[in-house]
């Protein structure tokens, strides 16, 4: 499911709970995606030794995964709500091609990979409703994404495993940085 079912199982259910606010819904959606990533990382780490590999830098050079930097306005110093929100949405849109790449990379967690992808689309919609300056959000070029996907899928097995590991790790970090910033808004 692209949206978490009811309350997080680890959360405390309060009787007659108020409907979730927009911010709470976004927070919960991110936590739901993080759960999915955690499950996917388990399979990746069990299947290969990528999680302990020191050769990450080699593969990382070929990937242009979104990352939070101070200039993006999401850090405490220079925090800027609108700039930060644009960065979060833009980053998530850029991750979509990498999430598409993950779709055929899992055996036992195929549904989980699909859930992460669909939940991210829902999260983007939530955030777009929150953003005032939608014009500042640049959507990735579909042609560029298509050729990137082809290139990633043409890699040898070791590089594909490493790419999967790096995407999951970077996506997790990006979501955590986003979660932290959104809680300030």
């Amino acid at each position: 499911a692209p949206v978490p079912p009811g309350e997080d199982s680890k959360d405390v259910a309060a009787p007659h709970r108020q409907p979730l606010t927009s911010s709470e819904r976004i927070d919960k959606q991110i936590r739901y995606i993080l759960d999915g990533i955690s499950a996917l990382r388990k399979e990746t780490c069990n299947k290969s030794n990528m999680c302990e590999s020191s050769k990450e830098a080699l593969a990382e050079n070929n990937l242009n995964l979104p990352k939070m930097a101070e200039k993006d306005g999401c850090f405490q110093s220079g925090f800027n709500e609108e700039t930060c929100l644009v960065k979060i949405i833009t980053g998530l849109l850029e991750f979509e091609v990498y999430l598409e790449y993950l779709q055929n990379r899992f055996e036992s967690s195929e549904e989980q990979a699909r859930a992460v992808q669909m939940s991210t689309k829902v999260l983007i919609q939530f955030l777009q409703k929150k953003a005032k300056n939608l014009d500042a959000i640049t959507t990735p070029d579909p042609t560029t994404n298509a050729s990137l996907l082809t290139k990633l899928q043409a890699q040898n097995q070791w590089l594909q495993d490493m790419t999967t590991h790096l995407i999951l790790r970077s996506f997790k970090e990006f979501l955590q940085s986003s979660l932290r910033a959104l809680r300030q808004m």
């Epitope: 680890k10 959360d11 939070m68 997790k172 955590q176 979660l179």
Partner: antibody
Framework: QVTLKESGPTLVKPTQTLTLTCIFS??????????VGWIRQPPGKALEWLAL???????RYSPSLKNRLTITRDTSKNQVVLTMTNMDPVDTATYYC??????????????WGQGTLVT | DVVMTQSPSSVSASVGDRVTITCRAS??????LAWYQQKPGKAPNLLIY???SLRSGVPSRFSGSRSGTDFTLTITSLQPEDFATYFC?????????FGPGTKLE
């Protein structure tokens, strides 16, 4: 296993700058979701949160002490440093460093150093 | 800042008793609440995070619950090693703030 240990002067004169170092092992800032914070406790009183530094070098400070505090880290040495300027007798307390590690950033402090008393 | 108030400030109890400590937040903090135990001369020790999640290794006699902005720590059958001071901490908004503590004696 996870350990943290604070070090620094036990005695500081008024107006001086206090520099405290937290050396840790068993985890690193390479893991997203990790943060290390400083908390102090005056003798017989409650805990007061001071500052925190994240895996990606973002920082948070207590607003009431923001102008006096600086938190930094050295990832290669696995240490976090807190400096506090313009010390005053009211700053007498046990200073703790503590770790938080949580995917959802709930900031519960799961491992603490033994604390260092600064007078 | 989110102000955390704790009651009672101290409580006398005997081994085997059920003890309840309450913490109130001055504003909504969702489920961002932790409980710590501290013994004299020692650092605090995390017992419960996210209102009711028991930290690994913490005895099941400790439990946490929430009702709005009121949070409760319950010790069902007090053991000799449970006599200590208990602090709550909100972790929803910066600055992170602690309650004044409840001394269990």
């Amino acid at each position: 296993q996870v350990t943290l240990k604070e070090s620094g002067p036990t005695l500081v004169k008024p107006t001086q700058t206090l520099t405290l170092t937290c050396i840790f092992s068993g985890f690193s800032f390479k893991t997203s979701g990790v943060s290390v914070g400083w908390i102090r406790q005056p003798p017989g009183k409650a805990l007061e949160w001071l500052a925190l530094i994240y895996w990606d070098d973002d920082k948070r400070y207590s607003p009431s002490l923001k102008n006096r505090l600086t938190i930094t880290r050295d990832t290669s040495k696995n240490q976090v440093v807190l400096t506090m300027t313009n010390m005053d007798p009211v700053d007498t307390a046990t200073y703790y460093c503590a770790r938080s590690y949580d995917d959802y950033l709930y900031y519960a402090l799961d491992y603490w150093g033994q604390g260092t008393l600064v007078t | 800042d989110v102000v955390m108030t704790q009651s009672p400030s101290s409580v006398s109890a005997s081994v085997g008793d059920r003890v309840t400590i309450t913490c109130r937040a001055s504003q909504d903090i969702d489920n961002f609440l932790a409980w710590y135990q501290q013994k004299p001369g020692k650092a605090p020790n995390l017992l419960i995070y996210k209102v009711s999640s028991l930290r690994s290794g913490v005895p099941s006699r400790f439990s946490g619950s929430r009702s709005g902005t009121d949070f409760t720590l319950t010790i069902t059958s007090l053991q000799p090693e449970d006599f200590a001071t208990y602090f709550c901490q909100q972790t929803r908004r910066f600055p992170l703030t602690f309650g004044p503590g409840t001394k269990l004696e």
